[in-house]
Amino acid sequence: YFGKLESKLSIIRNLNDQVLFIDQGNRPLFEDMTDSDCRDNAPRTIFIINMYKDSQPRGMAVAISVKCEKISTLSCENRIISFKEMNPPDNIKDTKSDIIFFQRSVPGHDNKMQFESSSYEGYFLACEKERDLYKLILKKKDELGDRSIMFTVQNED
């Protein structure tokens, strides 16, 4: 069971300092951006991190949304990352959800975050290069020190 708490506005970066944004095709991508680029591309660079109370404490449960014309929420349905046009619900009556991730700091590094899927144990949000694009994907990972599954989250509130 997940119950919605507060939310915060954040900029998410990979460890190469590339900024996460949602492109015109609703794809989550990473790109090099200056601070002014980041501001100019808002709201596509501003993510709403919705925190949830978890009936089985497993880390900070979050849903990640973005508000462009409408609110879209990050989902990992069938292990594929996409933004679905939906508001994060107030309550989720299950211990797993395709839109809930556990945000945890990397041990010894409070500023580096990992996001593990609540639906798929051992699967993490990751940045992966595909041709010329740096994509946000869901990746099964058993080397947890890999930088591709680490991110920084800068609060904008």
């Epitope: 497993r58 880390g59 945890r104 010894g108 051992g122 058993d142």
Partner: antibody, heavy 126, light 107 residues
């Protein structure tokens, strides 16, 4: 309690191949991997590689990648490690082990080698 | 590859002594470090995971500490059954690498 039971000792000639098996008995959750570790007589532990039973993807240590093949038969819960072009330096005890997530009190994941096979002695001698 | 430098290579101590074994990683391994004990002719057994978390059933005289690149296994009051070999393992990145091992002997 998970147990790993390995095949028996083998004596091989240089240049030959050996295939060691590792059968899981007991209840094991999903989301584990099989790793193989070897230990030459009187020496330390050396990681050889791993296989993911979910998709058969493998990762091998650089020094073994041209000679080792790790496979898994999900229907029998058995993992295999085949090492080819054997030489005398490959004389060692070969262990299979499971690589599984353990969690701390905040749910943070850590992978550990928790269950180990009894080891299989492979002797390479002419 | 991440190198794990373990020291000492051997140690001889008396029952009741405090024994410390260290592992130094060549880069930050984010506490993704486990410690194993191995008795002669047996497979290794997990003692500590996540640098400082005691595996179920392991006596509380064993403890682990460290972060970043420096890690320590401590046996607070040595017992006769603690004789054996001890290894650290970094699980941060492939290839996984073990320390060279420490042979612990009871005087």
């Amino acid at each position: 309690q998970v147990q790993l039971v390995q095949s028996g000792a083998e004596v091989k000639k240089p240049g030959a191949s050996v295939k060691v098996s590792c059968k899981v008995s007991g209840e094991i959750s999903t989301g584990y991997y099989f790793h193989w570790v070897r230990q030459a007589p009187g020496k330390g532990l050396e990681w050889m590689g791993r296989i993911d039973p979910e998709d058969d993807s493998t990762k091998y240590a650089e020094r073994f990648k041209d000679r080792v093949t790790m496979t898994e038969d999900t229907s029998t819960d058995t993992a295999y490690m085949e090492l080819s072009s054997l030489r005398s330096e490959d004389t060692a005890v070969y262990y299979c082990t499971t690589w599984r997530i353990y969690r701390d009190s905040s749910g943070r994941p850590f992978y550990v080698m928790d269950a180990w096979g009894q080891g299989t002695l492979v002797t390479v001698s002419s | 590859d991440i190198q794990m430098t373990q020291s000492p290579s051997s140690v001889s101590a008396s029952v009741g002594d405090r024994v410390t074994i260290t592992c130094l990683a060549s880069e930050d391994i984010y506490t993704y470090l486990t410690w194993y004990q191995q008795k002669p002719g047996k497979a290794p057994q997990l003692l500590i995971y996540g640098a400082n978390k005691l595996q179920d059933g392991v006596p509380s005289r064993f403890s682990g500490s460290g972060s970043g690149t420096d890690y320590t296994l401590t046996i607070s009051s040595l017992q006769p059954e603690d004789e054996g070999d001890y290894y650290c393992l970094q699980g941060s990145k492939f290839p996984l690498t073990f320390g060279q091992g420490t042979k612990l002997e009871i005087k």
